[in-house]
C-alpha cells in the first residue's frame, strides 16, 4: 500500500510572521517525479506543482491547512499555518507530540531583532529565564509537559508579551503482542 | 554601505526651535532604529531618544520628553530631530546614529558627522 | 536609570603598553554594553558590542570582556592612533545611559 505523504516545514514552526518566509515539502517514499505533486490550501488546488511549496514574504491569507497529494496516493495530513503580526511569537515544533519525541520552544522577535530577558510560562507559571534569549529543549516529552505556553521578553528595550500557544502531549500507542 | 548624512550648523535664540536632519545614503533605515545623541562642548555623551522608522515609534529620554520630538520620513529615508524651547546649556553636538538590533545588542554601529547647535542671544 | 561609572577618567600610557578601561553599571546588564572610541573634532566610533564583540574593521589590539556590572576594554598593545576618549554604554533600558568617558594620552 503506498504511503500517504507527509509535509514538512522549513523552518520547522508552523506560526510565522507576516512577511517571512517558509517552505513546505512533500516527502513520501518513492516520489521520483518532480511536478507530480497537487497542494491543496484551506482545500483549494494551487498552482504549484513541485514537491515544495515555497511562501515568500507570507501575508495573513497564507495561514489555513496545507495538504499534498502525490500521484493518486492518498492526500497527506494537514499542517496549519498561522501568519502573525504582532512583537514576539512562541514558536513550537510541534502543537501535538507524542510522548517520548522531542519538543522545541522558541520565543521569536518580529523581524529577527534582539530579544532579551526572556521568560517561558506554562500554564502561569514561569518555566526558564534567560537575559540573553534561548530556545528551550524538551528532549521527552511527557503528558505533564501538555499546556498552554507563552513568553515574555524585551524588544527595543520594551517588553512585550506573546500570545499563548496550548501544546499536547499524547501517550503513544502501545503495541500488541498475541499469544500464537 | 550605509552612511548617516546630517544637515549643518545652526546658531539659534533662546526659546526658539531648531530641526536637524539626518539622511541615510547608500541604504536605507530598512529595520533599524536611529538614536539621537549629544554632546555638549567638553562633556561627554548623553543619549536623547530614538525612533524605529518602520513602526514610527519614538522614546525619549526623561530629561527631554515634552521638547524633544523625533521623527522619520521613510520615503526619504530621513529621520528628524526637533528641539524646543531652546535654552544656552542645549549648546552642542548633536548626533544621529543607527542602532543595530541584529545580534549588535542595539548597540550604534553607524554615526552621522555631527551638527553644531548653538544657542545664543 | 542604569549608572555606567568609568573611573579614571584619563590615563597616560606609551606605545606598546597594554591599558585597561573600566566600565561598571549599578545594576546588572548582562552583555548588554557597547564601546565607543572617539577623537577630538570627530563623531564617535563603536569598537565593541555585546560586551566582547569586536566590530567589523576594528583592529584586534582591542577587546571587550565582562559581564553583569563589571567590564572592561583592553587595548593589547598601545598605538598612536589609539589616543582618544573611550565611552562605554549600556543598551538594556531606557534611558540609554553612557559612561563619562575615559580620555587616552601618549606619554
Known amino acids: 500500500v503506498p504511503q500517504k505523504p507527509k509535509v514538512s516545514l522549513n523552518p520547522p514552526w508552523n506560526r510565522i510572521f507576516k512577511g517571512e518566509n517558509v517552505t513546505l515539502t512533500c516527502n513520501g517514499n518513492n516520489f521520483f517525479e518532480v511536478s507530480s505533486t497537487k497542494w491543496f490550501h484551506n482545500g483549494s488546488l494551487s498552482e504549484e506543482t513541485n514537491s515544495s511549496l515555497n511562501i515568500v514574504n507570507a501575508k495573513f491569507e497564507d495561514s489555513g491547512e496545507y495538504k499534498c497529494q502525490h500521484q493518486q496516493v492518498n492526500e497527506s495530513e494537514p499542517v496549519y499555518l498561522e501568519v502573525f503580526s504582532d512583537w514576539l511569537l512562541l514558536q513550537a515544533s510541534a502543537e501535538v507530540v507524542m510522548e517520548g519525541q522531542p519538543l522545541f520552544l522558541r520565543c521569536h522577535g518580529w523581524r529577527n531583532w534582539d530579544v532579551y530577558k526572556v521568560i517561558y510560562y506554562k500554564d502561569g507559571e514561569a518555566l526558564k529565564y534567560w537575559y540573553e534569549n534561548h530556545n528551550i529543549s524538551i528532549t521527552n516529552a511527557t503528558v505533564e509537559d501538555s499546556g498552554t505556553y507563552y513568553c515574555t521578553g524585551k524588544v527595543w528595550q520594551l517588553d512585550y508579551e506573546s500570545e499563548p500557544l496550548n501544546i499536547t502531549v499524547i501517550k503513544a500507542p502501545r503495541e500488541k503482542y498475541w499469544l500464537q | 554601505e550605509v552612511q548617516l548624512v546630517q544637515s549643518g550648523a545652526e546658531v539659534k535664540k533662546p526659546g526658539s526651535s531648531v530641526k536637524v536632519s539626518c539622511k541615510a545614503s547608500?541604504?536605507?533605515?530598512?529595520?533599524?532604529?536611529i538614536s539621537w545623541v549629544r554632546q555638549a562642548p567638553g562633556q561627554g555623551l548623553e543619549w536623547m531618544g530614538r525612533i524605529i522608522p518602520i513602526l514610527g515609534i519614538a522614546n525619549y529620554a526623561q530629561k527631554f520628553q515634552g521638547r524633544v520630538t523625533i521623527t522619520a520620513d521613510k520615503s526619504t529615508s530621513t529621520a528628524y530631530m526637533e528641539l524646543s524651547s531652546l535654552r544656552s546649556e542645549d549648546t552642542a553636538v548633536y548626533y544621529c546614529?543607527?542602532?543595530?538590533?541584529?545580534?549588535?545588542?542595539?548597540?550604534?554601529?553607524?554615526w552621522g558627522q555631527g551638527t553644531t547647535v548653538t544657542v545664543s542671544s | 536609570d542604569i549608572q555606567m561609572t568609568q573611573s579614571p577618567s584619563s590615563v597616560s600610557a606609551s606605545v606598546g603598553d597594554r591599558v585597561t578601561i573600566p566600565c561598571r553599571a549599578s545594576?546588572?546588564?548582562?552583555?548588554?554594553l557597547a564601546w565607543y572610541q572617539q577623537k577630538p573634532g570627530k563623531a564617535p566610533k563603536l569598537l565593541i558590542y555585546a560586551a566582547s564583540n569586536l566590530q567589523s574593521g576594528v583592529p584586534s589590539r582591542f577587546s571587550g570582556s565582562g559581564s553583569g556590572t563589571d567590564f572592561t576594554l583592553t587595548i593589547s598593545s598601545l598605538q598612536p592612533e589609539d589616543s582618544a576618549t573611550y565611552y562605554c554604554?549600556?543598551?538594556?533600558?531606557?534611558?540609554?545611559?553612557f559612561g563619562g568617558g575615559t580620555k587616552v594620552e601618549i606619554k
Open positions: 547608500g541604504g536605507t533605515f530598512s529595520s533599524y532604529a
Open positions: 554604554q549600556q543598551t538594556d533600558s531606557f534611558p540609554l545611559t
Open positions: 545594576q546588572g546588564i548582562s552583555s548588554w
Open positions: 546614529a543607527r542602532v543595530n538590533p541584529f545580534g549588535y545588542y542595539y548597540a550604534m554601529d553607524v
